[in-house]
């Protein structure tokens, strides 16, 4: 017997095609067939219009084996058409179809929306032999139905290679709607005017959207969906959700967070990687970003001198890595360095200032009054010069550099001699008899080698020649001297 | 365009109703809600309360419940505010108007003046 | 009930002048709506959800505000702007109407 099976009267199909009947339940039961002793009889429900003339693939059988009568064509019952149920409910149909005893080996498939059901669904035939004819009644079952399960169902059955193949049975699993687009998390410029987006599905239709904002509905008549909620702008963050009506209920949308672009905080943790005497390698923790990408940073690098101007000096640089060589500094010298960056509203304060020192650099002047002669032994160049007039900066002389280039007969030799920073005279062996030597010279701090003199050029002779005359740095803009003897 | 137009005009003597009418036109009337805003004499607006025109539900604000009924013809699109046992602080010009997101009042009918007097 | 508080009740202003018209909500609201009204005339939209000009309505007009402080401002008055103009808040039921500024002509 049905229990609760109520037809219902559709103002429009849900679905293609002719819905022989219509059937909605939270129960749904099937009707009594007449049943052998000891089975438990398949349910199923009765025709929704058994007189209406069937328009699906029939079989049209050829003549009995006796040759007197054709016999009527094969054709499944009519049943119902349209099954509307709540998701999560059990659900139970059929199809039958009567078969006369001369046709052997018959098998019946169910078929969803053109394709074939295989495996492991609840699909049970059953068989109830006559006299004449085979009742075939082919059930499907889904227990706890979900929206997937929505969709057309048709039995089909092969009798000598020919299809027949049932009225479709339409399965609507209806629920709480079913969000397609949430919002969607955003960092919008402030009282600027940006969108929303929000669309549910049943079924049941219609889906009807609320609007909230900070647990305030927006609107406050519903709004067929899809929606777009154009927010007219913001001076502080806010959160946004959208609410799915339909005749089931409601289901709420995640809410997301609508934060306002600011100014980045300011960098903090500046720190000293490596200094050296004009250059100085910092690094920073960036910080908060206003929720908008940083675009570049700004170094500002302050010289702490009294006697300084006070101008800062200010070296762009990209927002990441987090570091930046400082160049073009005085060496031994105290600087105070900030950074700060930007996004696209603006630049963020300046990170707390932090001292560096530059190292004491290299000489940055050579030595001077360079001269250059034999000694009376013939077997020593003696070397005199002046000490350079260095800056603070350069640090404390350590000595001298002394490069002697010896040439002969294309063949040239360089050496390198290191003095102490008391002296300002040296003596050199003579290498090579018959030769050029050309000296220069260059003061040295803990900061490195600083340039070295001009050239100056003494003929060593062959043996047997004397002579004491020097050879001397020139006077800026004359050529290099050259003693000949 | 869009128009909200109301009746005209009400004298009425204390303890009998009135029935204002307020006839939108120029938009899907069910679509958005009609808000009442009463104005007495020399005062200010003072919200009254409103109507949903999709499901015919009236919400009143504090103040507006009993003697005041909100009510809608959605064929053809017109909204009424009913007062009933009128009493002369009744007396005031009501305007309907339309309400959009945020709760803003978009557009305005012309008012109705209902004078309350024995 | 939200509580709008508008002052000046009234201002006196010669065209030309910046008006400055404030309302001050007795809790945080979400956005703030402004209306004109003239003698024996219905209200007319002015500033939607804070800082919006409603359609037709002239840029000397601008809204600003968030929280409890919002404000209305004229930049130079002309004199057709003499008028009450009322607040309106939107965040929670019921919708409630400051009491009103009069701008009156010096």
């Known amino acids: 017997a049905i229990t609760e099976a109520r037809e219902e009267a559709k103002p429009y199909p849900l679905f293609p095609g002719p819905l022989p009947g219509s059937l909605q339940t939270d129960h749904t039961s099937l009707l009594s067939l007449p049943h052998t002793s000891g089975y438990q009889p398949a349910l199923m429900f009765s025709p929704t219009q058994p007189g209406r003339p069937y328009t699906g693939n029939v079989a049209i059988p050829r003549v009995t084996s006796a040759g007197s009568k054709l016999l009527p064509p094969l054709a499944f019952k009519h049943t119902v058409g349209h099954i509307i149920l709540s998701e999560h409910k059990d659900v139970k149909f059929n199809c039958s179809i009567s078969v006369p005893n001369i046709y052997q080996d018959t098998t019946i498939s169910w078929w969803k929306d053109g394709k074939e059901l295989l495996g492991a669904h609840h699909a049970i035939t059953q068989f109830y032999p006559d006299d004449e004819v085979t009742a075939i009644i082919a059930s499907f079952s889904i227990t706890s139905v979900q929206r997937s399960d929505n969709g057309s169902y048709i039995c089909k059955m092969k009798i000598n290679n020919e299809e027949i193949v049932s009225d479709p049975i339409y399965i609507e699993v209806q629920g709480l709607p079913h969000f397609t687009k949430q919002p969607e998390s955003m960092n919008v410029t402030r009282n600027t005017a940006f969108n929303l987006t929000c669309q549910a599905v049943g079924p049941p239709e219609p889906v009807n959207i609320f609007w909230v904002q900070n647990s305030s509905r927006v609107n406050e008549q519903p709004e067929k969906s899809p929606s777009v909620l154009t927010v007219p702008g913001l001076t502080e963050m806010a959160v946004f959700s959208c609410e799915a009506h339909n005749d089931k209920g409601l289901t709420v949308s995640k809410g997301v967070q609508i934060n306002i672009k600011a100014i980045p905080s300011p960098p903090t943790e500046v720190s000293i990687h490596n200094s050296t005497a004009h250059s100085i390698l910092i690094s920073w923790v960036p910080g908060f970003d206003g929720y908008s990408p940083f675009r570049n940073c700004s170094v500002q690098v302050k010289e702490v001198d009294p006697l300084s101007n006070g101008s800062v000096m200010i070296f762009n640089t990209s927002a990441s890595p987090h570091m930046y060589q400082i160049k073009q500094l005085q060496a031994l010298a105290n600087y105070s360095i900030g950074v700060s960056c930007m996004n696209e509203i603006g630049w963020s304060a300046v990170s707390p200032w932090i001292l560096a020192s530059t190292t004491e650099g290299a000489p940055s002047v050579a030595p001077l009054n360079v001269t250059v002669f034999l000694n009376e032994s013939r077997d020593n160049v003696d070397i005199r010069w002046m000490k350079p007039l260095t800056k603070r900066q350069a640090g404390e002389l350590v000595g001298y550099r002394i490069s002697h280039v010896w040439q002969s007969a294309g063949i040239s030799k360089e050496l390198l001699e290191e003095v102490g920073q008391n002296n300002s005279r040296a003596q050199i062996s003579v290498q090579v008899h018959n030769a050029t030597c050309t000296v220069r010279i260059a003061a040295v701090t803990k900061g490195g080698v600083g340039p070295f003199s001009d050239p100056v050029k003494i003929f060593i002779p062959a043996h047997g020649w004397v002579d004491h005359a020097p050879s001397s740095t020139p006077a800026p803009g004359n050529a290099d001297p050259v003693l000949i003897i | 365009q869009v128009q909200l137009v109301q009746s005209g005009s009400e004298l009425k003597k204390p303890g009998a109703s009135v029935k204002v009418s307020c006839k939108a036109s120029?938009?899907?009337?069910?679509?958005?809600?009609v808000h009442w805003v009463r104005q007495a004499p020399g005062q200010g607006l003072e919200w009254m309360g409103w109507?949903?025109?999709?499901?015919?539900?009236?919400t009143y604000a504090q103040g507006f419940t009993g003697r005041f009924v909100f009510s809608l013809d959605t064929s053809v699109s017109t909204a009424y505010l009913q007062i009933s046992s009128l009493k002369a602080e009744d007396t005031a010009v009501y305007y309907c108007?339309?309400?959009?997101?945020?709760?803003?009042?978009?557009?305005w009918g012309q008012g109705t003046l209902v004078t309350v007097s024995s | 009930e939200i509580v709008l508080t508008q002052s000046p009740a009234t201002l006196s202003l010669s065209p030309g002048e910046r008006a400055t018209l404030s309302c001050r909500a007795s809790?945080?609201?979400?956005?703030m709506h402004w209306y004109q009204q003239k003698p024996g005339q219905a209200p007319r939209p002015l500033i939607y959800?804070?800082?919006n000009l409603a359609s037709g309505i002239p840029a000397r007009f601008s809204g600003s505000g968030s929280g409890t402080s919002y404000t209305l401002t004229i930049s130079s008055l002309e004199p057709e702007d003499f008028a009450v103009y009322y607040c309106?808040?939107?965040?929670?039921?019921?919708?409630?109407f400051g009491g009103g500024t009069k701008v009156e002509i010096k």
């Open positions: 108007t339309r309400g959009a997101r945020y709760a803003y009042m978009d557009y």
């Open positions: 120029g938009y899907t009337f069910a679509n958005y809600g």
């Open positions: 109507i949903n025109t999709y499901q015919g539900e009236p």
């Open positions: 809790s945080s609201v979400g956005y």
């Open positions: 959800a804070t800082s």
């Open positions: 309106q808040q939107w965040s929670s039921n019921p919708r409630t």
